[in-house]
Interface confidence: low
Amino acid sequence: ARGPRCSQPGETCLNGGKCEAANGTEACVCGGAFVGPRCQDPNPCLSTPCKNAGTCHVVDRRGVADYACSCALGFSGPLCLTPLDNACLTNPCRNGGTCDLLTLTEYKCRCPPGWSGKSCQQADPCASNPCANGGQCLPFEASYICHCPPSFHGPTCRQDVNECGQKPGLCRHGGTCHNEVGSYRCVCRATHTGPNCERPYV
């Protein structure tokens, strides 16, 4: 802040301000902690009154240094404390879900166990771990789908795949296929060996 005639008695700069002359005019150049024509007022922005990333500006109100806040997008009010377009303000997450802002008008709900959906409004169909034998549960509409490993099938991956039903057979050179849970076993003739009777017996 700048004021007149700071080299005159009674007009000196206070609080460490420096009196500088430019273009025939004398003025106090204040340090950051003080403002005003003679650096007489504490800088009201030092207390960071503007919240939510608002920017503080020193303003003169009838000769007294005051502040004004320029608020960041999404906030208003003298101290930028009033949210505007905050999608979480309406508490969109139900059943104990936690609302996270993605942008000021877009939110994502972190749902507690047993709930899913945009607003945690859907009972999570996968919460009971319905997919057996290492199957992966995926919520689908109001229900679920199990993605089963290769050896199992069925709605909950509980049905064993009969590998011995494949054509051509898995057991080579006249070997006999025996189905097992999640797998199969070849019983080879005397002439061959290996998991699929693929190697001649030497």
Epitope: A53, T55, S70, C71, A72, L73, S76, L84, D85, L102, T103, L104, T105, E106
Partner: antibody
Framework: EVQLVESGGGLVQPGGSLRLSCAAS????????MSWVRQAPGKRLEWVAY????????SYSDAIRGRFTISRDNAKNTLYLQMNSLRAEDTAIYYC??????????WGQGTLVTVSS | DIQMTQSTSSLSASLGDRVTVSCSAS??????LNWYQQKPDGTLKLLIY???NLHSGVPSRFSGSGSGTDYSLTISNLEPEDIATYYC?????????FGGGTKLEIK
């Protein structure tokens, strides 16, 4: 289908006034914040003013603050921009836009305001 | 105010090319960046919001990326209807500000 149609532009003398309107249809007008954006001939887009859902909060660019007023009538699905003390540098195409996802997701076709003596 | 700079004011490319339009902010804007397309007739459309999110109805050949102060819009396979001017816009702080635009032309 979302539609925004501006009107009210024209030729006005420096110091004069104009009132722009933007008629909205195809969506629930009162559920969206709105903005005016302008573009001077051959120049970049310049945000002008913003208004929230009920008209309680407005914000303006420094270039027009104190001269322009943004308002809305939710019953008529219409956005307004009252422009006073117009200057030559206010000559531009004025667009109204709907705000969603913190972006202006739909725009009108624009209305030309020419300030000249 | 936050200044948005699009260093390339015009860009010439061939159909089928991969084109990148860049935009930089005078300070970090935390991914609060949108991209718009303005056709020669003045029609304006939102392409991408919040740096990477494709607006509904926008072809998937458009994509956005960036962080901090530097952002870009990529068109992976240039088509004739992509001839337009592209603007970035920040909404980190009022006043919202736009880049100067990059005009895309066909070679």
């Amino acid at each position: 289908e979302v539609q925004l149609v501006e009107s009210g532009g024209g030729l006005v003398q420096p110091g004069g006034s104009l009132r722009l309107s933007c008629a909205a249809s195809g969506f629930t007008f009162s559920s969206y914040t709105m903005s005016w954006v302008r573009q001077a001939p051959g120049k970049r887009l310049e945000w002008v003013a913003y208004i929230d859902y009920g008209g309680d909060f407005t914000s303006y660019s420094d270039a027009i603050r104190g001269r322009f007023t943004i308002s809305r009538d939710n019953a008529k699905n219409t956005l307004y921009l009252q422009m006073n003390s117009l200057r030559a540098e206010d000559t531009a195409i004025y667009y109204c836009s709907r705000r969603r996802y913190d972006a202006m997701d739909y725009w009108g076709q624009g209305t030309l305001v020419t300030v000249s003596s | 105010d936050i200044q948005m700079t699009q260093s390339t004011s015009s860009l010439s490319a061939s159909l089928g090319d991969r084109v990148t339009v860049s935009c930089s902010a005078s300070q970090a804007i935390s991914n609060y960046l949108n991209w718009y397309q303005q056709k020669p007739d003045g029609t304006l459309k939102l392409l991408i919001y919040y740096t990477t999110n494709l607006h509904s109805g926008v072809p998937s050949r458009f994509s956005g990326s960036g962080s901090g102060t530097d952002y870009s819009l990529t068109i992976s396979n240039l088509e004739p209807e992509d001839i337009a001017t592209y603007y970035c816009q920040q909404y980190s702080k009022f006043p919202w500000t736009f880049g100067g635009g990059t005009k895309l032309e066909i070679k």
